[in-house]
């Protein structure tokens, strides 16, 4: 039996660091403090990332791709900190970094595996193409390839089209779903397993409303508690679809608590907004107000779409005048 103090040589300690595209990260490395410290950071064992010895940086042979992007924690080197501060990581920076630290009495080598992820906030869009209605979940830039799942009335859908275009350093993905004639609710989830980040889009169709000209209509829009967190920044947009395109009626920004209204007949109840109820009223309806009204509540983690179909019919007076 080996005594407790016995251990076998492990060539290198290895750590995994996950960074986000264009953000700064720290590659960790520690050593038992000593004098005459030498620190070399290398990429894939060949490209020189950062060198330090005799009390200062020596970057003459630094690979150009790291220029002005690396630094050490100089005040902490004497305490055994050889970590590298790395600015604006890109997908090309992914790989294995080796930190060599030498002192008068010890030599240490640490290995850090850097993985870089991208997850630009996805969107859920509702589109009409001729007579068909589509929900599209899309993410402009994502890496690695995400997992996209669709549910209809909380039941997973196996049919899942994915249109993918790959750029040099990330994927752009569209996942369309034909929902023509459906009154079901739909949910789309996009998951970046590396960044452990999930985004959810939810679409709900409300029952159609029939109104008379000159009346007013109240359209509900309340977020589902499962997703909604009032502490997180979000945006609410009400829009109306006319001839296949949406025009924005009003929007609300939670960060500034600002409401911008583009349609004079539109009204929002401030008290309801404070209670996270974004239902709206449209006054003095006219025939051209018939159509689809979309409430979009969006944050970095979700998009909640609620759609109302409004039919405005001529009032009796109008009909008798005709």
């Amino acid at each position: 039996i080996f005594p407790l103090a016995f251990f076998i040589y492990v060539p290198m300690n290895e750590q995994i660091v996950i960074g986000r595209l264009d953000e700064d990260i720290i590659l960790p490395s520690s050593f038992e403090r000593g004098s005459e410290v030498v620190i070399h950071w290398k990429y894939q064992d060949s490209y020189k990332v950062h060198s330090y010895y005799k009390g200062s940086d020596h970057l003459e042979s630094q690979d150009p791709r790291y220029a002005n992007r690396t630094s050490l924690f100089y005040n902490e080197i004497q305490n055994g900190n050889a970590s590298l501060f790395f600015r604006r990581v890109s997908l090309l920076d992914e790989g294995i970094y080796t930190c060599y630290v030498g002192t008068a009495i010890q030599v240490i080598t640490n290995k850090v595996v850097l993985k870089v992820g991208v997850f630009l906030t996805p969107v859920m869009k509702y589109e009409k193409r001729n007579t068909n209605s589509f929900l599209i979940c899309s993410v402009l830039s994502v890496y690695p390839r995400p997992i996209i799942t669709w549910k209809m009335d909380n039941t997973p859908i196996s049919e899942n089209n994915m249109e993918e275009t790959g750029s040099l350093d990330s994927f752009s993905i569209n996942s369309p779903l034909n929902i023509t004639g459906s009154n079901s609710s739909y949910e789309c989830t996009i998951e970046n397993s590396l960044l452990k980040q999930t985004w959810t889009g939810r679409w709900t169709m409300k029952d159609g409303l029939h109104k008379m000209q000159s009346e007013h209509v109240s359209l509900s829009c309340q977020p589902v508690n499962d997703y909604f967190s009032p502490n997180q920044d979000f945006k609410v947009t009400w829009s109306r679809m006319k001839s296949g395109t949406f025009s924005v009626l009003a929007y609300y920004l939670s960060s500034s608590q600002n409401t911008i209204i583009n349609e004079s007949r539109f009204s929002w109840n401030k008290e309801l907004i404070n209670q996270s109820d974004f239902s709206m009223n449209l006054m003095d309806l006219n025939l051209s107000d018939s159509g689809e009204y979309l409430c979009n509540i969006s944050s970095d983690e979700y998009t909640l779409l609620t759609i109302h179909t409004v039919h405005v019919e001529p009032s009796q007076e109008t009909a008798s005048h005709n």
């Epitope: 520690s30 030498v38 060198s51 010895y53 008068a104 009495i105």
Partner: antibody, heavy 116, light 107 residues
């Protein structure tokens, strides 16, 4: 005073393994990296790698990757180097040497002869 | 790996002579060079590190100099006990590498 005392000479057949020990005294064993350096007959010095008794990641020479195993027993301030799949060109004197990036103190050397 | 090329491979000198041994690195090693002395059947002994810092107990006749890729060990006045083989080593980065050695013999 600092002393590094190595195990005796070994004769091994090709394909076998050899384990050399290095018992230290006179300094705090866990503070220093223990390196292994070999010297073939009439040749120069070749660094094989090091081990940190305090369990920090240790450096090694890729040339020996997969063949060399370095271990320590801190309770008796002793380092070990095992070289497997021996070949005739592994015939050399094997030294343990303590220090950081330069080697302050050396063992007396262990001659390992690989011969069929 | 960084190559260390030592010259000459051997030299003959007399007691009292000034002896110079050079070592050329395949890349800039930022003065991270050590020198060792080895006598037959013995382990090497550290003389100098960081190109010009003498190790404890090393006589002042041994001195080191250099920068970048070129380094020199000088013995100002050769003594009988200095006849040995001398090795340079770069301690800039792993794998640590040695020169092939310079044997200093009695003329």
């Amino acid at each position: 005073q600092v002393q590094l005392v190595q195990s005796g000479a070994e004769v091994k057949k090709p394909g076998a393994s050899v384990k050399v020990s290095c018992k230290t005294s006179g300094y705090t064993f866990t503070e220093y990296t223990m390196h292994w350096v070999r010297q073939a007959p009439g040749q120069g010095l070749e660094w094989m790698g090091g081990i940190n008794p305090n369990n920090y990641g240790a450096p090694y020479n890729q040339k020996f990757k997969g063949r060399v195993t370095m271990t320590v027993d801190t309770s008796i301030s002793t380092a070990y180097m095992e070289l497997s799949r021996l070949r005739s060109d592994d015939t050399a004197v094997y030294y343990c040497a303590s220090g950081g990036y330069y080697f302050d103190y050396w063992g007396q050397g262990t001659l390992v002869t690989v011969s069929s | 790996d960084i190559q260390m090329t030592q010259s000459p491979s051997s030299l003959s000198a007399s007691v009292g002579d000034r002896v110079t041994i050079t070592c050329k690195a395949s890349q800039d090693v930022g003065t991270a060079v050590a020198w060792y002395q080895q006598k037959p059947g013995k382990a090497p002994k550290l003389l100098i590190y960081w190109a010009f810092t003498r190790h404890t107990g090393v006589p002042s006749r041994f001195s080191g100099s250099g920068s970048g890729t070129d380094y020199t060990l000088t013995i100002s006045s050769l003594q009988p006990e200095d006849f040995a083989t001398y090795y340079c080593q770069q301690h800039y980065d792993t794998p640590f590498t040695f020169g092939q050695g310079t044997k200093v013999e009695i003329k």
